[in-house]
Every structure is written in structure tokens, then in C-alpha cells.
């Protein structure tokens, strides 16, 4: 058993049929010695008396809020949560496996630049009685500070018969140098509590590996006189690290006909302009990627040819 | 047919093209190592991230773009760079910084070159003949060093008398390649920045 936060405790249980469970001793936080009784949740049934209560925790029915009273007055509470271990593996029932970039990916994180700011998100089908708390650090043995905000519900989607909820959190490394070469990864730890079930999820990464620039901005077409050709130009996104001559981007330019059957034409270029032969109903799209370290491509910025 | 081709125009910072070739060569070599040594811990997640130049060179600090010198977090470990004689003219200070930066890059390349050559000598003794260093990568390191045109004492190639542990050597190769790739990215950024300046 360990303390998650004040008056909230996590009991780690090997979860299999007829498991013996864990013996837990609760102590009432009071100077009083006599006349103390214990109850569980809203029940008035007295579970025991005395300053300590010994219980055998085997299942969710044994978890919950234990309260010690004296003469009708509440003295203190202890909330017991269960953390299940099945076949030596901690349960992952609360969050959905996003399977990207690999199986057992519950947390996904992205950074728009090298400032040390990043966003993580996760998915669940659970809509109520759900709380999250997020901690992060750079390295684990001698951790350096990363500050995370509160996790918030950021999107709701319907997936078949189910509703899916996306939660996200923003974190910022306390003292980040954009030009630094990372040798210790960022660690992100999410505590998830659904009713009386506790689970924890972790992710470890280097900022350089989770970079995904915003799409190029101000994508514009300028027709060239006496020609079917147009000059396409775009700019670095505002959120990208500066100076741009140091944190350079490369771009993918794509020309796509109206029908998906028409073959695309595409090139990669380090410039922020290109000349394109614009056919009726075609569209021009541009996306960005760090020029020197191949992490994710941005989403596309697109403009119609007409 | 392949005609001899002139080098990029001289207005271009001469090392930029070499540094781009370096990054390409290191990335290719790392990819090859990860494929060939698929049953070894050779991915970014599996290896220890070591920097053989730590405490010996200060490339990141010495080559920091001027725009980032206002960032306190970037100045933490800066002992040498930007601390110059107060009476120096701005242009002299800039050229001094650039010289410091480029000589630091040169020292990095020299250290990695020695490590890679030593390692290759060991790998050539492996009866499995599983992996060797790409000669193109070694040539590209050499080309960039020549383009940087610094003179410094030659570091003797480390030779060891004991029987090499090929498993350890291959893991060390992965560690070295990952670290060198990260340094090659920094070098490319620096060359791009200097070219634009």
C-alpha cells in the first residue's frame, strides 16, 4: 500500500481467482483513543472499533472511503483504491491503446518546436467518475523539472456505438534550450482513477522525436503572365523555432487533380516557393518537416488551383 | 555519362554541402546498423545516450546562434564561448566566435573519426563479418575536416591488445552512431546558419 495523495491510498493486488489479497491496517488520524468506530462509504454498518482497523482487501467491494467516527462526529477519512496486476502486468483498462506508432501506446505526445513545450493526449470510452493527474521530468535518476497543467477533456468523438473521449495536457520544461542536444529523455507519468480503480501510464521520449511543425502559413498562388504556370509561395509557421536559418524546415509540395485516380505530382524542396502548372480543379498542398531531423510531417496546408 | 561536376558556387558557405553529405551518410549508416543488428539493442529507446565529446568540446555552446544567447537556459554551460576580450570589435568578436565554433566542430569530427576507425579495425576481425563502417561515411568526415582546414595534432588510433568483445563493440557502434547523428544535425544547423549570415 502507498499514499497517492493525502488520505488516498493505493493497494496493489495480484488479481486472480481466490487470491489472498492484501492485509491493510488503517489508523484514525486523531488524538482520541476510545469510542472510535469505522464505516465504509455511505453505509452505517460498523466494521470495527478502535484507533486502527485491519482489513483484508481482495476485491473492489473492499475498496472505498473508510471513515472513523466518535459519537456521531467524523474524525478522518482514508480512501482506498485498487491497482490490479494480472499475470505480472498492471491493468490498462481505463485508457484505450492508440496503437500508433506501436502497440501499447496509451499516451501520445507532440511538440510544435524545440522550446521544451509539448502536448500529450490519451483516449478513453469512460465518461464519468474519472480523474487524471500528470507529472513529468527530464530523466528519472536525477530528474530536472517539467511543469504540466491540468488534464482537460479536449474532444469527443463517436466511434460506432461508442463515444470516445480525448483528454490532453500541456507541459513545459522549466529550463529548455532549443539548441540543446538531448541525452536524457522526458518522462511523462499519468495517474488515472476511475471510481475505485487506479492505473498509471508512462511515456518516455526526446523532444526531437515528437516534433511536428504546424502547417506552413500564408500559402498563396500568383499567376505568371502569359503562362499556365503559377508561383506558389508559403512561409514558416509562427510557432516554429527561430532563427529559421538554424532551425530550418524542408517542404513537400504536392499537386493533386480533382479525381483521386489522377496521379499526384510531388517534390521536396528547402525553398519557400515553387512554380506549378495549375490545372482546372487541381489543388496544391504543402507540408513541413524539420530539415535535418526527420520527425513527423506537419498537416497539409492546401489551396485550390482555380 | 558522369561528367566531373564543379563544386557549388563559392558564395555558398563551403562547408554546408559537406555537412549535408555527412548527415546523409551518418543517417544511412545508422539505418544499416539498426537493420543488420536487429537482435542487438540498437534503437534510440534501447541504447544509453553517451557523448564522447562531453567535457572535451563545446560545439552546441560555441556555435549557438546569436538570437539564442539571450536565452538563460542556453547559457548555463557556456564557459568558453562569447566570453571574449571586452575591447574587441563586434566583427572581430563574431569572427572569433565563428573560429571557436568551427574548431570545436573540427575536434568533434577528429574524435569520432578516431573512434570509428578503431572500431572498424575490431569489426574487421569479427569472424561473423556482420557489419563494417561505411567507407563513404569515413570519407565524408575526412572531406568536412579538410574543408574546415584546421591544423591540430593527429590523434593516434587507439589499439588494444586484448581480444575484442564483438557483442560489446557492436553495441558501442550503435551508441556512437546515434550520438554522431545528433551531432551531425547540430553541425548541419550551424552551417546553414553561418551560410545565411
Amino acid at each position: 500500500i502507498w499514499e497517492l495523495k493525502k488520505d488516498v491510498y493505493v493497494v496493489e493486488l495480484d488479481w486472480y481467482p481466490d487470491a489472498p489479497g492484501e492485509m491493510v491496517v488503517l489508523t484514525c488520524d486523531t488524538p482520541e483513543e476510545d469510542g472510535i468506530t469505522w464505516t465504509l462509504d455511505q453505509s452505517s454498518e460498523v466494521l470495527g472499533s478502535g484507533k486502527t482497523l485491519t482489513i483484508q482487501v481482495k476485491e473492489f467491494g473492499d475498496a472505498g472511503q473508510y471513515t472513523c467516527h466518535k459519537g456521531g462526529e467524523v474524525l478522518s477519512h482514508s480512501l482506498l483504491l485498487l491497482h490490479k496486476k494480472e499475470d505480472g502486468i498492471w491493468s490498462t483498462d481505463i485508457l484505450k491503446d492508440q496503437k500508433e506508432p506501436k502497440n501499447k501506446t496509451f499516451l501520445r505526445c507532440e511538440a510544435k518546436n524545440y522550446s521544451g513545450r509539448f502536448t500529450c493526449w490519451w483516449l478513453t470510452t469512460i465518461s464519468t467518475d474519472l480523474t487524471f493527474s500528470v507529472k513529468s521530468s527530464r530523466g528519472s535518476s536525477d530528474p530536472q523539472g517539467v511543469t504540466c497543467g491540468a488534464a482537460t477533456l479536449s474532444a469527443e468523438r463517436v466511434r460506432g456505438d461508442n463515444k470516445e473521449y480525448e483528454y490532453s495536457v500541456e507541459c513545459q520544461e522549466d529550463s529548455a534550450c532549443p539548441a540543446a542536444e538531448e541525452s536524457l529523455p522526458i518522462e511523462v507519468m499519468v495517474d488515472a482513477v476511475h471510481k475505485l480503480k487506479y492505473e498509471n501510464y508512462t511515456s518516455s521520449f526526446f523532444i526531437r522525436d515528437i516534433i511536428k511543425p504546424d502547417p506552413p502559413k500564408n500559402l498563396q498562388l500568383k499567376p505568371l503572365k502569359n503562362s499556365r504556370q503559377v508561383e506558389v509561395s508559403w512561409e514558416y509557421p509562427d510557432t516554429w523555432s527561430t532563427p529559421h536559418s538554424y532551425f530550418s524546415l524542408t517542404f513537400c509540395v504536392q499537386v493533386q487533380g480533382k479525381s483521386k485516380r489522377e496521379k499526384k505530382d510531388r517534390v521536396f524542396t528547402d525553398k519557400t516557393s515553387a512554380t506549378v502548372i495549375c490545372r482546372k480543379n487541381a489543388s496544391i498542398s504543402v507540408r513541413a518537416q524539420d530539415r535535418y531531423y526527420s520527425s513527423s510531417w506537419s498537416e497539409w496546408a492546401s489551396v485550390p488551383c482555380s | 555519362r558522369n561528367l566531373p561536376v564543379a563544386t557549388p558556387d563559392p558564395g555558398m558557405f563551403p562547408c554546408l554541402h559537406h555537412s549535408q553529405n555527412l548527415l546523409r551518410a551518418v543517417s544511412n549508416m545508422l539505418q544499416k546498423a539498426r537493420q543488420t543488428l536487429e537482435f542487438y539493442p540498437c534503437t534510440s529507446e534501447e541504447i544509453d545516450h553517451e557523448d564522447i565529446t562531453k567535457d572535451k568540446t563545446s560545439t552546441v555552446e560555441a556555435c549557438l546562434p546569436l538570437e539564442l544567447t539571450k536565452n538563460e537556459s542556453c547559457l548555463n554551460s557556456r564557459e568558453t564561448s562569447f566570453i571574449t576580450n571586452g575591447s574587441c570589435l563586434a566583427s572581430r568578436k563574431t569572427s572569433f566566435m565563428m573560429a571557436l565554433c568551427l574548431s570545436s566542430i573540427y575536434e568533434d569530427l577528429k574524435m569520432y573519426q578516431v573512434e570509428f576507425k578503431t572500431m572498424n579495425a575490431k569489426l574487421l576481425m569479427d569472424p561473423k563479418r556482420q557489419i563494417f563502417l561505411d567507407q563513404n561515411m569515413l570519407a565524408v568526415i575526412d572531406e568536412l575536416m579538410q574543408a574546415l582546414n584546421f591544423n591540430s595534432e593527429t590523434v593516434p588510433q587507439k589499439s588494444s591488445l586484448e581480444e575484442p568483445d564483438f557483442y560489446k563493440t557492436k553495441i558501442k557502434l550503435c551508441i556512437l552512431l546515434h550520438a554522431f547523428r545528433i551531432r551531425a544535425v547540430t553541425i548541419d544547423r550551424v552551417m546553414s546558419y553561418l551560410n545565411a549570415s
Epitope: R266 | V5, H17
Partner: nanobody
Framework: EVQLVESGGGLVQAGGSLRLSCAAS???????MGWFRQAPGKEREFVAV????????DYGDSVKGRFTMSRDNAKKAVYLQMNSLKPEDTAVYYC??????????????????WGQGTQVTVSS
């Protein structure tokens, strides 16, 4: 190995036009193609580059708006239409096959195969 042969060069007055052609001995449809030029005593200079399907192009600053590159993959050929020619356009023009299928580059060493070149002279 692809052989390239340029043609269409010659002597032209300033303000005039020329159309250069580059014929390839094998398929060029899966690579970018470029035109470069070299004036006596000067570095080889990037002129234009074209994507595999010919819809995306890039031009050197000195020729933008005056030159137009195109390709015909079925004919295994690329072309360079040069209008409003200036004396400073005088050079040997080379066509080249890019080493990659889809990365634009202005750097000659990023191109694999080169033609022998065709001389363009613009008189004032």
C-alpha cells in the same frame, strides 16, 4: 546508365528566343530533371528543375519569368524554352538526371548523369 544529348543551342541576338532539347537514351520518368549552365571561368549554375510528372518546377533567380522548362516522359525528353535572352545568358547548357526521384536541388553533385552540353551565345 542513361545517356543525355542536348541540342538547340546557337547564336541569337539579345531579346531573342531559343528552345533547347535534351534526349535521353533510357527512361527518365522516375527522376527529377535539371538544367544547368556554365560560362567560361565560372562555376556551374543552376537554371531549372522539374518534377517527375512535370507539374512542379523551380528556376534560378536569374532566369525566373524568362525561361520555361517542360518534359515529355513518353519521348524521354526535357526542354528549356528561353525567351528575352540577355548576353549574360551566354554559356554551355547541360541537362542532368537527379539522383533522387523527388527532391529538388540546385547543387550539381545531387545529379547523376549529364549531357555533353550545348553552347548558347547571346550577342548584344
Amino acid at each position: 546508365e542513361v545517356q543525355l544529348v542536348e541540342s538547340g543551342g546557337g547564336l541569337v541576338q539579345a531579346g531573342g528566343s531559343l528552345r533547347l532539347s535534351c534526349a535521353a537514351s533510357g527512361s527518365i520518368s522516375s527522376n527529377i530533371m535539371g538544367w544547368f549552365r556554365q560560362a567560361p571561368g565560372k562555376e556551374r549554375e543552376f537554371v531549372a528543375v522539374i518534377s517527375r510528372r512535370g507539374l512542379i518546377l523551380d528556376y534560378g533567380d536569374s532566369v525566373k519569368g524568362r525561361f520555361t522548362m517542360s518534359r515529355d516522359n513518353a519521348k524521354k525528353a526535357v526542354y528549356l524554352q528561353m525567351n528575352s535572352l540577355k548576353p549574360e545568358d551566354t554559356a554551355v547548357y547541360y541537362c542532368a538526371v537527379g539522383k533522387t526521384t523527388d527532391r529538388f536541388s540546385e547543387i550539381p553533385s545531387d545529379y547523376d548523369y549529364w549531357g555533353q552540353g550545348t553552347q548558347v551565345t547571346v550577342s548584344s
